[in-house]
Amino acid sequence: QCSCSGSTVDCHGLALRIVPRNIPRNTERLDLNGNNITRITKTDFAGLRHLRILQLMENKISTIERGAFHDLKELERLRLNRNNLQLFPELLFLGTAKLYRLDLSENQIQAIPRKAFRGAVDIKNLQLDYNQISCIEDGAFRALRDLEVLTLNNNNITRLSVASFNHMPKLRTFRLHSNNLYCDCHLAWLSDWLRQRPRVGLYTQCMGPSHLRGHNVAEVQKREFVCSDEEEGHQSFMAPSCSVLHCPIACTCSNNIVDCRGKGLTEIPTNLPETITEIRLEQNSIRVIPPGAFSPYKKLRRLDLSNNQISELAPDAFQGLRSLNSLVLYGNKITELPKSLFEGLFSLQLLLLNANKINCLRVDAFQDLHNLNLLSLYDNKLQTVAKGTFSALRAIQTMHLAQNPFICDCHLKWLADYLHTNPIETSGARCTSPRRLANKRIGQIKSKKFRCSGTEDYRSKLSGDCFADLACPEKCRCEGTTVDCSNQKLNKIPDHIPQYTAELRLNNNEFTVLEATGIFKKLPQLRKINLSNNKITDIEEGAFEGASGVNEILLTSNRLENVQHKMFKGLESLKTLMLRSNRISCVGNDSFTGLGSVRLLSLYDNQITTVAPGAFGTLHSLSTLNLLANPFNCNCHLAWLGEWLRRKRIVTGNPRCQKPYFLKEIPIQDVAIQDFTCDDGNDDNSCSPLSRCPSECTCLDTVVRCSNKGLKVLPKGIPRDVTELYLDGNQFTLVP
């Protein structure tokens, strides 16, 4: 149906109801104007990574799915004028960083949400005239610093905040006439703003109060912008901010209840009516509850998030819900309740956390829940509960703690006493260990039976801080805060290392690459990692991300050939770095950047021939540097090190030269500066890129061909990882 010419596809005026399939991937201009398209789906423009101009005006588009423009990385101009858009999806332009012209005029848009243009930072021309806009959320235009043309005329705007426009230095055309501007104290700023820009915002007039109706805003004196006494004192002249409210597509909203049960949602809907008292979000696929997800809904009394996939809850996910009576979170994947999660939920009567994977409770988790009547923690992974966890629950009548793997040691004695005094646990919670108490009801065991073995169980001792979270991993041994996984033929770090771990022993295993799994982000107490006696050849960038408390790493006896600073990213507190007995041949000038806390660095027994100038310059705390047992080539490239070793008061054990022959076994710092020479072809600097190819040769992967080149000496810069070297047909008199 469409016509294609070069990179232009023309489908205009064809009465199309949907965007046609199979638009060529190389399309740069697409004309779909003058059709009957009603909806833009997130797959309609998928893959059109070269599209620059998209014409969608004069259709009947009422819905644009979020992500519809995500692939349009090159999009520069988009025309959506003369459609039926009412709701403006947030984050619609997240992928269109090059968009500079956007026409949304002549639609029925009622509000501009705060994140409307997030991602489209290059917009220069934005047309929003002839809509029904009554609300522009604060910050909606904040990212649009390059805006030159903004048309908001012929809308229903009554109020605007100064924050919306005071960051547009390039604005040259601005139209705001034909709105319903109410010229009270909240709009006083606009008069000044327009006077400072006499060429923009022409004919902008007040529509109220009645005595200012028809007056040009720029001509009204500041003292005439007044509010009633009650309003004047309100929030120090803050304009009541509007917010964009709607019932999410697929949900039903009535009587202040938003019902989104079983709608396949993957995230919490935003911008719901602020008066809602109940949200039903059960049986969806929500994974994350972000910060302040429900904070606008001050009247919320019941929130049901059961049977989702929730594994991550922001600490302030439920902030501000002072009227909340019921919070239903059962049937999710919650492993931990962040600190302060339930802070301020003073009205909560029911808290259902059953059927999750909660492995610990902070001692203050429930401190504000004075009116809680029922707490269900049934079917979780709790091994212990710290004394005092339930002390704030003054109104508690029913508690479900069964189906948890409780360790009934001395740290759980208090719970038995508590349940004897308050027989509120109605689900029949039982011990899992020790074996002598296994399967017995906690509330029926005599308290003297709750004992600890000689070495107190750290897992339960630290439970109030949520370090009692995980059992000892299979193949490891856990004693105190040491987790010993040595000699187990491991080639990767076990999952579920306990959070309380301070020392992690992974030595004498089969590691070859230390992968960036993010494991250390979950180990806030970690101080020492032993990775000695493995087969590590590489450490991925970010492997130690999150290990900010680690102060000792042992990488002795591995197979590292080079060291780069990216390997050690995240080790801000590292004091000891042992790299003994590896295969390091060169130390670059940025090998150790970012390790400003390191005091002891051992490079003993490697194959280091050279060290780039300044290699240790960023190690501000260095006091011991072991460079012994390395075959240093004391040529001109190493002169700086002799000088540095003399100047620095660092214990080094006097590393010695191995080359050239006349300096063999001489301590580097004893070599006179003029003796560091690159004579007789000795200018090897093995820190030069390993992959370079001698100019006389050709290199393919690790094969180097230098045949028939009339060579008398070995060419310089042969890659160190060479596997095949062809030197036939040359003029060598000696074997090089």
Partner: antibody, heavy 118, light 107 residues
Framework: QVQLVQSGAEVKQPGSSVKVSCKAS????????VSWVRQAPGQGLEWMGG????????NYAQKFQGRVTITADESTDTVYMDLSSLKSENTAVYYC???????????WGQGTLVTVSS | DIQMTQSPSSLSASIGDRVTITCRAS??????LNWYQQKPGKAPKFLIY???NLQSGVPSRFSGSGSGTDFTLTISSLQPEDFAIYYC?????????FGGGTTVEIK
């Protein structure tokens, strides 16, 4: 929103028991609290007890402990109130009610009149 | 149990009148007080929760106030459909308890 539909009026002999049902329509109430409140003729309202269907365990007012049993059938979204050892002073309208917390009653059934008379 | 006392037990008023009903708790219940309206032969209807919050669909002429032990329900301008019995109820502690009711009749 949830609508609560109760079973019909009952006339019972003293000493017998009565079982009143309350069915939810317009949405499951498996994780809601469902309470029973009674009102004797010309009298005020009196809370008897409540249940959360997914747990099955009920919570009773001291006054009714031992004589009232509240149960739930999740599969049919129905809650039952069983009152035994009936006396003439148990003649009342029995309401089921549900709400956002244990003790707030947003929605009410239409009521079931139980008359105890020989 | 917490006792709830309503006053007056009945009152007569005309259409358009401002009507005030009070409710007193035998101990501090913070703001955990609800108001219900009941018409003859009907189930109670939820009006106000947490002392001052209007339930959805309830006309704005109804308002509630108070905290601690003393609470008030006010009807700013009585309408024909407002003639009924009004109950307060505390939701602070078990068992929840109701006031004895206030009957609002036509004068």
């Amino acid at each position: 929103q949830v609508q609560l539909v109760q079973s019909g009026a009952e006339v019972k002999q003293p000493g017998s028991s009565v079982k009143v049902s309350c069915k939810a329509s317009g949405g499951s109430f498996r994780s809601y609290t469902v309470s029973w409140v009674r009102q004797a003729p010309g009298q005020g309202l009196e809370w008897m007890g409540g249940i959360i269907p997914i747990f099955g365990t009920a919570n009773y007012a001291q006054k009714f402990q031992g004589r009232v049993t509240i149960t739930a059938d999740e599969s049919t979204d129905t809650v039952y109130m069983d009152l035994s050892s009936l006396k003439s002073e148990n003649t009342a309208v029995y309401y089921c009610a549900t709400g956002s917390g244990w003790y707030t009653f947003d929605y009410w059934g239409q009521g079931t009149l139980v008359t105890v008379s020989s | 149990d917490i006792q709830m006392t309503q006053s007056p037990s009945s009152l007569s008023a005309s259409i358009g009148d401002r009507v005030t009903i009070t409710c007193r708790a035998s101990q501090n219940i913070n703001s955990y007080l609800n108001w219900y309206q009941q018409k003859p032969g009907k189930a109670p209807k939820f009006l106000i929760y947490a002392a001052s919050n209007l339930q959805s669909g309830v006309p704005s002429r109804f308002s509630g106030s108070g905290s601690g032990t003393d609470f008030t329900l006010t009807i700013s301008s009585l309408q024909p459909e407002d003639f009924a019995i009004y109950y307060c109820q505390q939701s602070y502690r078990s068992p929840p308890t109701f006031g004895g009711g206030t009957t609002v009749e036509i004068k």
